[in-house]
Interface confidence: low
């Protein structure tokens, strides 16, 4: 099949999650091909490293294309001391990389 | 309507350099995204690099990092790729494309004819 881009998104925890003490930032990757795509985390336009996973689904079975989610994880502390949150996704489908992001407080 | 034509392609010892190029006419050539893209006998095509209008950003796959250099030349409406380091397994057939697209979505709707790289060990 033809290459097809990624639509991307992000997603804040949730103050139910931010009540237990910890912060679940997730980048959703919706309908894309083929399956290899990059997602970074940055945090204030810091590159972060080794505190996400990725999750991949198999080839939709209609189109066969791909989702991926990215969650970043940190402790509420750490989560408050930030503003910006940001996901940046490369992928050949994309001319450039994509960069989703919120404003902590404002979504 | 986008006409596109890649050259540089030839036989190369692994270690050694090619520099491609793709002859773009029919738009502002400025004002579009290219890209290079690759296919080996047998295999998917796969991206190898882009370079944004204007000619500020590039994104470049994790096997062209480091030995690969895309850049454009807006007065020659050419784009070229500048490969270093050339490995047996970069031996594939080139072709460059073009996203026109305002937003450079990564919708390549215009493709080249493509030229043959070949690298031996």
């Known amino acids: 099949r033809t290459v097809a881009a990624p639509s991307v998104f992000i997603f804040p925890p949730s103050d139910e999650q931010l009540k237990s003490g910890t912060a679940s930032v997730v980048c959703l990757l919706n309908n894309f091909y083929p399956r290899e795509a990059k997602v970074q985390w940055k945090v204030d336009n810091a590159l972060q490293s080794g505190n996400s996973q990725e999750s991949v689904t198999e080839q939709d079975s209609k189109d066969s294309t791909y989702s991926l989610s990215s969650t970043l994880t940190l402790s509420k502390a750490d989560y408050e001391k930030h503003k910006v949150y940001a996901c940046e996704v490369t992928h050949q489908g994309l001319s450039s990389p994509v960069t989703k992001s919120f404003n902590r407080g404002e979504c | 309507q986008v006409q596109l034509q890649e050259s540089g392609g030839g036989l190369v010892q692994a270690g050694g350099s090619l520099r491609l190029s793709c002859a773009a006419s029919g738009r502002t050539f400025r004002n579009y995204a290219m890209a290079w893209f690759r296919q080996a006998p047998g295999k998917e095509r796969e991206f190898v690099a882009v370079i944004r209008r204007g000619g500020g950003d590039t994104y470049y796959s994790d096997s062209a990092e480091g030995r690969f250099t895309i850049s454009r030349d807006n007065a020659k409406n050419t784009v070229y790729l500048q490969m270093n380091n050339l490995k047996p397994e970069d031996t594939a057939v080139y072709y460059c494309?073009?996203?026109?697209?305002?937003?450079?979505?990564?919708?390549?709707?215009?493709w080249g004819q493509g030229t043959q790289v070949t690298v031996s060990s």
């Open positions: 494309a073009a996203d026109v697209s305002d937003d450079n979505t990564g919708k390549y709707d215009y």
